[in-house]
Amino acid sequence: EEELQMIQPEKLLLVTVGKTATLHCTVTSLLPVGPVLWFRGVGPGRELIYNQKEGHFPRVTTVSDLTKRNNMDFSIRISSITPADVGTYYCVKFRKGSPENVEFKSGPGTEMALGAKPS
């Protein structure tokens, strides 16, 4: 069985204030069973950006349909970027557990930084 890899191809993403940013994340295996969440930052201070299973994340949309059984693309779009959005974003695979899911593997991260202002 192939070991799961979390692929975030862009190390750096330059974004424009007010625009939409696309953060890419694909996985190489459907196993283990469990959700993929997005965070900004690492460690206990990390900020939850998107959780497909619970919560309401109005500025975030998924690129693919996460409800499809064989989906391996967990990329997201964040709309209406502000300066407070800068930071490094990680897609993180969790293994289904009881009562709590357990963090399994993190992508390498994509740093979001502000590029040129809109003309």
Epitope: G18, G41, G45, R46, L48, P58, S80, T82, P83
Partner: antibody, heavy 119, light 108 residues
Framework: DVQLVESGGGVVRPGESLRLSCAAS????????MNWVRQAPGEGLEWVSR????????DYADSVKGRFTISRDNSKNTLYLQMNSLRAEDTAVYYC????????????WGLGALVTVSS | ETVLTQSPATLSVSPGERATLSCRAS??????LAWHQQKPGQAPRLLIY???NRATGIPDRFSGSGSGTDFTLTISSPQTEDSAVYYC??????????FGGGTKVEIK
């Protein structure tokens, strides 16, 4: 329906401590950043502190830094504000407020808890 | 730090007479501005977010406009129950979150 109910307010002397609680219901508490905002008698709204969804990331207004500690227990759907070394100028109604998403406005407010610091 | 200045401090209007409240930011906040209403003895309530979007359950007599540094909250035909203090809040740069000083609206 979203509900936020503060408790723990009261009258204390300068230098004493108090802990406020905010019981949350009607939403996925662990998915949202939470805040404390206060309002001195006859005055406007002053943001006090913020805690991220996981509880490991905190921010404070300069006026309370080093004296107040925000925390949360996601298993109990409860937000806390530990207030030490209280001063007369901390006298206010303290509101807990839910954030719409991690980088956003406050969409729901509690009813408030009155803290009076007086000798 | 971004400072929000609201004007006027007090606004007295007759029922049905248009009320216009202003909020000015010391630097651009894009469209990241919300308006909250606070009636006497009550907690604040969200009215408008992202400068112009009405929150759930807010009557359409309330509208918001503006971007950058200048924002307006309009009550097209005020009712007596609209007597309250109105606060703007920016969430473009934080921490700290900032509120304006408030505008007290009195319905004659």
């Amino acid at each position: 329906d979203v509900q936020l109910v503060e408790s723990g307010g009261g009258v204390v002397r300068p230098g004493e401590s108090l802990r406020l609680s905010c019981a949350a219901s009607g939403f996925s508490f662990r998915s949202y950043a939470m805040n404390w905002v206060r309002q001195a008698p006859g005055e406007g709204l002053e943001w006090v502190s913020r805690i991220n969804s996981g509880g490991g990331g905190t921010d404070y207004a300069d006026s309370v830094k080093g004296r107040f500690t925000i925390s949360r227990d996601n298993s109990k759907n409860t937000l806390y504000l530990q207030m030490n070394s209280l001063r007369a100028e901390d006298t206010a109604v303290y509101y807990c407020a839910k954030q719409y998403d991690w980088n956003s406005f406050f969409d729901y407010w509690g009813l408030g808890a009155l803290v009076t610091v007086s000798s | 730090e971004t400072v929000l200045t609201q004007s006027p401090a007090t606004l007295s209007v007759s029922p049905g007479e248009r009320a216009t409240l202003s909020c000015r930011a010391s630097q651009t906040v894009g469209s990241k501005l919300a308006w909250h209403q606070q009636k006497p003895g009550q907690a604040p309530r969200l009215l408008i977010y992202d400068a112009s979007n009405r929150a759930t359950g807010i009557p359409d007599r309330f509208s918001g406009s503006g971007s950058g540094t200048d924002f307006t909250l309009t009550i097209s035909s005020p009712q007596t129950e609209d007597s309250a203090v109105y606060y703007c809040q920016q969430y473009y740069y934080w921490p700290p979150y900032r509120f304006g000083g408030g505008t007290k609206v009195e319905i004659k």
